[in-house]
């Protein structure tokens, strides 16, 4: 028998791969901030809104300095999958009030999906261990009222906005170490 198969071939320039992922993340961050501002204009938020089903924010200023690439990409992918699911849920169950955020919510969903594919590609190009398939998530309960849908939208966009900023910073720091 021939030699055992080697590890997957690493991309010639991992910095370039990481760079295009950073740019996609930045675009999505800008879109999210704009959409969150639009939501706040239409439905002003009183205080912070939380949603128990959203991922816990993976950030602290100190933690940014200690990041490692596999951990960042795995965590980011898991969190963004959760946000994708929440955006889909919001579009489906958010009620007529949130229809005023279309087509922007649809664009956001498409860009989130694109970034997730990009992360998957980056992980395989960098020969990082692939995370196990995601267990099926329990379905999200529909909002109890129209205002509940709006509060959920504030929480989802606010959390995504923070997650993406953390991701951009983390990825940029990691790029300098490659």
């Amino acid at each position: 028998p021939g030699p055992p198969p080697g590890p997957p071939r690493v991309s010639p320039d991992p910095r370039a791969e990481l760079d295009s992922t950073v740019l996609l993340t930045r675009s999505l961050l800008a879109d999210t901030r704009q959409l969150a501002a639009q939501l706040r204009d239409k439905f002003p938020a009183d205080g912070d809104h939380n949603l128990d089903s959203l991922p816990t924010l993976a950030m602290s200023a100190g933690a940014l300095g200690a990041l490692q690439l596999p951990g960042v990409l795995t965590r980011l992918r898991a969190d963004l999958l959760s946000y994708l699911r929440h955006v889909q849920w919001l579009r489906r169950a958010g009620g007529s009030s949130l229809k005023t955020l279309e087509p922007e919510l649809g664009t956001l969903q498409a860009r989130l999906d694109r970034l997730l594919r990009r992360l998957q590609l980056l992980m395989s190009r960098l020969a990082l261990p692939q995370p196990p398939p995601d267990p099926p998530a329990p379905p999200l309960a529909p909002p109890s009222s129209a205002w509940g849908g709006i509060r959920a939208a504030h929480a989802i966009l606010g959390g995504l906005h923070l997650t993406l900023d953390w991701a951009v910073r983390g990825l940029l720091l990691l790029k300098t170490r490659l």
Partner: antibody, heavy 119, light 111 residues
Framework: EVQLQQSGPELVKPGASVKIPCKAS????????IDWVKQSHGKSLEWIGD????????LYNQKFKGKATLTVDKSSSTAYMELRSLTSEDTAVYYC????????????WGTGTTVTVSS | DIVLTQSPASLAVSLGQRATISCRAS??????????MHWYQQKPGHPPKLLIY???NLESGVPARFSGSGSGTDFTLNIHPVEEEDAATYFC?????????FGGGTKLEIK
């Protein structure tokens, strides 16, 4: 009205430190980064770094790592930049600016703080 | 770091005429989504003021006589018709990579 208010001029001795405040008003402080920019006399502008007021995440220009430290106090909507081990090279006007998340352009600028390093 | 070269370093334009300022980047600052180039105006003793962001978007409150264009490595700021109050130094800035950098500035004088 959206404003970034900075403190008055600072005259400091070589080797000393200085901490410059930048107080934001007229917008949601956590919606934007606060960036810091240096302008030496009659020269162009240099980006020092930025901070996200939500959780204090920072990014620095490699040139200013170890020279500048950025912090925020969310409760007072104030960002700070501390400059240490000052030399005559650090004599400049320092601006804080509101940075668009993810895009790094600066749509609102502070009044500027002149730092003069002299013995 | 990406180097931005502005030209000319200074120019004098008659009132009502067109002022054209160029900014060339040492590598492309454009992607499929955005061109990460921005323009500022600075008057003596004052902070810079954002005029144009992402190559061609006019900042709110900035007069329509200011316009930006370009992609890749070559960008232009146009002012037409030039007014007395436009006498200032103009800077380009990219944000394609970190650190963002600024051009050396172009001083506009009104004849």
């Amino acid at each position: 009205e959206v404003q970034l208010q900075q403190s008055g001029p600072e005259l400091v001795k070589p080797g000393a430190s200085v901490k410059i405040p930048c107080k934001a008003s007229g917008y949601t402080f956590t919606d934007y980064n606060i960036d810091w920019v240096k302008q030496s006399h009659g020269k162009s502008l240099e980006w020092i770094g930025d901070i996200n007021p939500n959780y204090g995440g920072t990014l620095y220009n490699q040139k200013f790592k170890g020279k500048a430290t950025l912090t925020v106090d969310k409760s007072s909507s104030t960002a700070y930049m501390e400059l240490r081990s000052l030399t005559s090279e650090d004599t400049a006007v320092y601006y804080c600016a509101r940075g668009e998340l993810g895009h790094w352009y600066f749509d609102v600028w502070g009044t500027g703080t002149t730092v003069t390093v002299s013995s | 770091d990406i180097v931005l070269t502005q030209s000319p370093a200074s120019l004098a334009v008659s009132l009502g005429q067109r002022a054209t300022i160029s900014c060339r980047a040492s590598k492309s600052v454009s992607t499929s989504d955005y061109s990460y180039m921005h323009w500022y105006q600075q008057k003596p003793g004052h902070p810079p003021k954002l005029l144009i962001y992402l190559a061609s978007n006019l900042e709110s409150g900035v007069p329509a006589r200011f316009s930006g264009s370009g992609s890749g490595t070559d960008f232009t700021l146009n002012i037409h018709p030039v007014e007395e109050e436009d006498a200032a130094t103009y800077f380009c800035q990219h944000s394609r990579d970190l650190p963002p950098t600024f051009g050396g500035g172009t001083k506009l004088e009104i004849k």
